[in-house]
Amino acid sequence: LPAQVAFTPYAPEPGSTCRLREYYDQTAQMCCSKCSPGQHAKVFCTKTSDTVCDSCEDSTYTQLWNWVPECLSCGSRCSSDQVETQACTREQNRICTCRPGWYCALSKQEGCRLCAPLRKCRPGFGVARPGTETSDVVCKPCAPGTFSNTTSSTDICRPHQICNVVAIPGNASMDAVCTSTSPTRSMAPGAVHLPQPVSTRSQHTQPTPEPSTAPSTSFLLPMGPSPPAEGSTGD
């Protein structure tokens, strides 16, 4: 004869465990139903009655099958430095990520506790390592023959143009200025630069942030601008 299907609540066989989506209630000493995501246990089971579940109250959630007496509170609303990438619903917590131009300076178990603005490299300095979701921009001084004339969290040092006749020599923060004859471009290591006419600038692609598997941010604590590091500037 096939074994009878037990309906919750039921006493488990000695040494056996409760089935999937059930839990063992120590007080009732019975296997009882868990509540589905988006719900919580309003009334715990007894020997004769199963768990009574209820929907999560506004701004609370449960993500898993559970028997908690109260749903978890969603995180605070996203701050102005953040973007809500996942809304608070009965089944999931709110997720806030740092908005473009910011990175997560202080992570927590799930999400981010603190967003901070990406460092901007000042003229004479370029981006050595681009910012990611969880790391700041690293600036470096422009090497001889290169320059950056911007205050930017994305611009790298670019090679000076090479002039047939130099009007003003370039430096770390300024391109060379040629007289009216056509300039040529210097060769950057590992890259080919075709000669450019005076009237056009070469197009430089911006470094793109590396992909990051860091957890998304949830909270932002108030924070002023970070002190500028060498070669960087605040907003």
Epitope: S55, D58, S59, S73, R77, A87, T89
Partner: antibody
Framework: QVQLVQSGSELKKPGASVKVSCKAS????????MHWVRQAPGQGLEWMGR????????KHDPKFQDKAVLSSDTSVSTAYLQISSLKAEDTAVYYC?????????????WGQGTLVTVSS | DIQMTQSPSSLSASVGDRVTITCTAS???????LHWYQQKPGSSPKLWIY???NLPSGVPSRFSGSGSGTDFTLTISSLQPEDFATYYC?????????FGQGTKVEIK
């Protein structure tokens, strides 16, 4: 844009009932609550109850439990407040207001209000 | 029920004054669940500060909110003519959700 448009003013006799409507537009009714708040002449705001239009679940201030019936019809994006056994002290402006799920009850949009006058 | 008591009930102030309104809850309220509304005569209330200290778009930065537990404040750093109105605090921490009795800010 988000709008809550309420039905017009009502003049009722004591003992009668009134049904006030609140038509929502410009947003999805799914993840919001619709609240009803009343304001007697020259008085403050008094929360009466709220409804989850998606499920029909309601919550009341116990003071209004037997007096106010909240309902909604999602097909026409409208919430309703029905007040029974009207008395002179029920004379007030009745507001509907929405709060999005997850916003901790902050009522970010309000209807223009419906004046209900109870007088014999 | 959580009682919300505002003080003062009304105040007279001049343009440019710093104004502080307090709201005291009869039991602790999580800061996420404390909101303020502004209402002008003949108009519907407007959400003015949410979750204790956050300003919805369109609310001037001279307004600020703070507090925790049972004591919360709304501050106007420099009162402007358009700020004369009644302000209500509101708790959504525990049902039934309740409002303070209101604070009317009038022109001196």
């Amino acid at each position: 844009q988000v709008q809550l448009v309420q039905s017009g003013s009502e003049l009722k006799k004591p003992g009668a009932s009134v049904k006030v409507s609140c038509k929502a537009s410009g947003f999805n009714n799914k993840d919001i609550y619709m609240h009803w708040v009343r304001q007697a002449p020259g008085q403050g705001l008094e929360w009466m109850g709220r409804i989850d239009p998606a499920t029909g679940n309601t919550k009341h201030d116990p003071k209004f439990q037997d007096k106010a019936v909240l309902s909604s019809d999602t097909s026409v994006s409208t919430a309703y407040l029905q007040i029974s056994s009207l008395k002179a002290e029920d004379t007030a402006v009745y507001y509907c207001a929405r709060s999005p799920y997850g916003d901790f009850g902050a009522m970010d949009y309000w209807g223009q209000g419906t004046l209900v006058t109870v007088s014999s | 029920d959580i009682q919300m008591t505002q003080s003062p009930s009304s105040l007279s102030a001049s343009v440019g004054d710093r104004v502080t309104i307090t709201c005291t809850a009869s039991s602790s309220v999580s800061s996420n669940y404390l909101h303020w509304y502004q209402q002008k005569p003949g108009s519907s209330p407007k959400l003015w500060i949410y979750s204790t200290s956050n300003l919805p778009s369109g609310v001037p930065s001279r307004f600020s909110g703070s507090g925790s537990g049972t004591d919360f404040t709304l501050t106007i750093s420099s009162l402007q003519p358009e700020d004369f109105a009644t302000y209500y605090c509101h708790q959504y921490h525990r049902s039934p959700w309740t409002f303070g009795q209101g604070t009317k800010v009038e022109i001196k």
